[in-house]
Amino acid sequence: FNISGCSTKKLLWTYSTRSEEEFVLFCDLPEPQKSHFCHRNRLSPKQVPEHLPFMGSNDLSDVQWYQQPSNGDPLEDIRKSYPHIIQDKCTLHFLTPGVNNSGSYICRPKMIKSPYDVACCVKMILEVKPQTNASCEYSASHKQDLLLGSTGSISCPSLSCQSDAQSPAVTWYKNGKLLSVERSNRIVVDEVYDYHQGTYVCDYTQSDTVSSWTVRAVVQVRTIVGDTKLKPDILDPVEDTLEVELGKPLTISCKARFGFERVFNPVIKWYIKDSDLEWEVSVPEAKSIKSTLKDEIIERNIILEKVTQRDLRRKFVCFVQNSIGNTTQSVQLKEKRG
């Protein structure tokens, strides 16, 4: 199809060679007067659409993406030729950075329902450049964490070295939807909830005497819990004595709850105390039996092939530890009567 009638948008992706980052292109279709498919014009940030970057009753996935080869060859279907580029509804996700992503990307409706739709397309000229050393050394990361329940902020990586006063107007999107009230280079979150996580995109316009282009950065925001302030607690065994039958096999389970730590090095082990001696027992590997956002429960068993009289004089101690401290729980075996 003839792409000369497509509206054109120029974008710049400056990527950091130090970190993994992603990039997105929105199928930002214009609105020819009589087209029913391209259901929106460029929106001012005051107009909040239901969906961004695409509106209308049509299925949001009803767009086709192409790349225009620089050598003038026919347009290539993105899905067939570029495994590192994923189409999700109206958005094109670039999973890996690199100058080889530079080029012209065209999107248009899959279904051409009227002659007007032929010109309903947008051509995005993407320039991809590695960040130069002269760029800001402490630019914000493309992966940012927000602490649940606290105050936090999301910074636009390409503008994080500029003060709020000198920063240009920024357009923010979250999961493809326009955040109409956000215009600065930083989004401040008064209280962080789990719904604040997602893919944020910040755009601002740069221009020289010849042309203008959109500088875009993508930020993956995670919501996390803060590191625990507590040492682990032992959930099992609860009792300090255990009735057993002599000569029978026995498994004692130690289950301990460890609070969340970003650097997580849990210790869970069994040792035996016999009068003045104590030694660690080589027991099966510890295994995680539950994982939540706030904590992890780890289990480690001690297995006795058969309980002997000597075992009744010993104490079996489960020892657990994290970066805050340690906890122990000892179990004394007692012969079952009758």
């Epitope: 996580q197 919501t223 539950k290």
Partner: antibody, heavy 115, light 111 residues
Amino acid sequence: SVEESGGRLVTPGTPLTLTCTVSGIDLSSNALGWVRQAPGKGLEYIGYISTGGSAYYATWVNGRFTISKTSTTVDLKMTSLTAADTATYFCARDSYAGDYAFNLWGPGTLVTVSS
Amino acid sequence: AAVLTQTPSPVSAAVGGTVSISCQSSKTVYNNNWLAWFQQKPGQPPKLLIYGASTLASGVPSRFKGSGSGTQFTLTISDVQCDDAATYYCLGSYISSSDNGFGGGTEVVVK
């Protein structure tokens, strides 16, 4: 959003992988679980994959199913399928605490096991 | 594995009335409160109503109330509406996730 795919008619014993594709959800801060429902029956919990990538399964699974993930998908690999595994398979996102409050569900994908 | 036993189906309720569904667990749920309630209508995926035994999920009307602790839990629907006709499930979570599971479901019929 979350959406399941890969459900189809298979013969007993044929392995099958279902995929749950997420968008706008960071799997490094959300657990994602699988639940199934046989026609006309109740919900059955299969298991979940934690934010750190560890998988946890209901006792009845007994090693037949495996849950794994990439940054945007969670797979449920099923082996030794029998007619009893015929069901709609749902994936569900949990962001509250790890594995107990599935607050966002996909529409489900139907798996039929029949000779 | 833990067993979750729900009120047998069906349970009838009159519009504007109150209905209660119980869920009993054979083991104590994690933290005494790791129990969730779901509503499911034919042809739809389940919808979360209550988590943490008593916390109302986002967007759920306050007519739905969860209570209980340990092994015994109840979902109460007050001022029942026609739209509440559905099957309700409890989901328990335990110290070991391998014990996690749903109750058998309770169908609520609204008259």
